[in-house]
């Protein structure tokens, strides 16, 4: 049940996550302009990854697209890479882990198979929700090394007698919106890593093997089990380790080839 | 045809308070944002405030902050100026106009003359 | 507060000919987002409200007649006439549109010489 819990709020989270990064990628909000030095501009200026916009008191709001491809800064060429490719892994993640979930079956699929596909969704999520943040980031080291620079522009270019308005932008709520969207992808993988170790059947953790003595039976169960006389006596005994916490009929609908001999 | 017809012509004394209305039509009063600008006799123009008739937010000239005060009355799309402590250079042409594109006044109401005399 | 300067004061100007008004902002006006200067000519005849000409500099306004026209750029800025015509009598005013408090110049009044 805690497994199956686990990997349920692990896909949950992920595709919240998945859906705020593919949400902060689309926001033209990634950068605003910063009004500490010019509260009273009538005039707003924002950017996101892939167009410019002003926003006009009067209401009036305009946005450009960044139609060329070669004339934009490397970094943000950078940043758009880093998100696009955490939306492909992120997609690509959700539709794997969507067959693994536990709660829907598939034909006569092995809970190995789903172990292995909840593991590589984890794992893809986790990288997917490490581009997003690294993006993110990346995009917020670019705005203040530039807001530095531009503050020192804007005091050194003070001799004339007449003044320009020198704009500075800031963190957009997109960059927001990417770190936590980041962070949810990342600990719905997280999620998804644990689940599998819960779903795996662990090779090494035999069930009660019974080699039939001359004169009685005495059930084996070696690696960390104690023997117990009885055939099958003890069958519903809890593991003393084990990835998830289950009972041990919880697993018999997928006999393994050690149940018995 | 976007119209915005202002009140008539209004005395006052020194210390009153006047309130001008100018009401729209022609298109959604909730759309675009009205300012108000004042012009004394035989001088320039002199932006007074912005107020957007979908949530009444304004935004004022600091030379008018404490004495203007801009309200709206969605149901019957009119705008309302209202002066108080009114001395004698508040004698003006008061104009209601709407906020474009560019930050610009594309139609004016044809002014109201508030005139501040002993 | 930006301060709008217009020159000159007052313009004659013959009738076909070219009038030509200047605007100087102490202050830029071009915003670095979209490379446009927010700036703004109105014209007013006598007893009239302004009626708008030009914004963002060089736009003309629909049903603004083309010999109206409007340049430059940061803190400079002009408002050609390029024929005068009789109903072109009138005061014009520019007007600083990217700063609260919005200012107008001064004006500058045109006449037929």
């Known amino acids: 049940m805690a497994v199956t819990a686990c990997q349920g709020l692990g896909f949950v989270v992920s595709l919240i996550g998945i859906a705020g990064i593919i949400a902060a990628t689309c926001m033209d909000q990634w950068s605003t302009q910063d009004l500490y030095n010019n509260p009273v501009t009538a005039v707003f200026n924002y950017q996101g990854l892939w167009r410019s916009c002003v926003r006009e008191s009067s209401g009036f709001t305009e946005c450009r697209g960044y139609f060329t491809l070669l004339g934009l800064p490397a970094m943000l060429q950078a940043v758009r890479a880093l998100m696009i490719v955490g939306i492909v892994l992120g997609a690509i993640g959700l539709l794997v882990s969507i067959f693994a979930l536990k709660c829907i079956r598939i034909g006569s699929m092995e809970d190995s198979a789903k172990a292995n596909m909840t593991l590589t969704s984890g794992i893809m999520f986790i990288v997917s929700g490490l581009c997003a943040i690294a993006g993110v980031s990346v995009f917020a080291n670019m705005l203040v090394t530039n807001f530095w620079m531009s503050t020192a522009n804007m005091y050194t270019g003070m001799g004339g007698m007449v003044q320009t308005v020198q704009t500075r932008y800031t963190f957009g709520a997109a960059l927001f919106v990417g770190w936590v969207a980041g962070g949810l992808t990342l600990i719905g993988g997280v999620m998804m890593c644990i689940a599998c170790r819960g779903l795996a059947p662990e090779e090494t953790n035999y069930k009660a093997v019974s080699y039939h003595a001359s004169g009685h039976s005495v059930a084996y169960k070696p690696g960390g089990f104690k023997a117990s006389t009885g055939f099958g006596s003890n069958t519903k005994n809890k593991k003393i380790y084990d990835g998830g916490a289950r009972t041990e009929d919880e697993v018999q609908s997928y006999p393994s080839k050690h149940d018995y001999v | 045809e976007v119209q915005l017809v202002q009140s008539g012509a209004e005395v006052k004394k020194p210390g009153a308070s006047v309130k001008v209305s100018c009401k729209a039509s022609?298109?959604?009063?909730?759309?675009?944002?009205l300012i108000w600008v004042r012009q004394a006799p035989g001088q320039g123009l002199e932006w007074i405030g912005t107020?957007?008739?979908?949530?009444?937010?304004?935004n004022y000239n600091q030379k008018f902050k404490d004495r203007a005060t801009l309200t709206v009355d969605k149901s019957t799309s009119t705008a309302y100026m209202e002066l108080s402590s009114l001395r004698s250079e508040d004698t003006a042409v008061y104009y209601c106009?709407?906020?474009?594109?560019?930050?610009?006044?594309?139609?004016w109401g044809q002014g109201t003359l508030v005139t501040v005399s002993s | 507060d930006i301060v709008m300067t217009q020159s000159p004061d007052s313009l004659s100007v013959g009738l076909g000919e070219r009038a030509t008004i200047n605007c100087k902002s102490s202050?830029?006006?071009?915003?670095?987002?979209?490379?446009?200067?927010?700036l703004t000519w109105y014209q007013q005849k006598p007893g009239q409200p302004p009626k708008l000409l030009i914004y963002?500099?060089?736009a003309r306004q629909s049903g603004v007649p083309d010999r109206f026209s409007g340049s430059g750029s940061g803190t400079d800025f002009t408002l050609t006439i390029s024929s005068l015509q009789a109903e072109d009598v009138a005061v014009y005013y520019c007007?600083?549109?990217?700063?609260?408090?919005?200012?107008f110049g001064q004006g500058t009044k045109v006449e037929i010489k």
């Open positions: 106009t709407r906020f474009r594109t560019g930050n610009s006044f594309d139609y």
């Open positions: 022609g298109y959604t009063f909730t759309s675009s944002w």
């Open positions: 107020i957007v008739p979908s949530d009444s937010y304004t």
């Open positions: 202050q830029s006006v071009l915003n670095s987002g979209n490379q446009k200067n927010y």
């Open positions: 963002w500099a060089v």
């Open positions: 007007q600083n549109s990217i700063a609260y408090p919005f200012t």
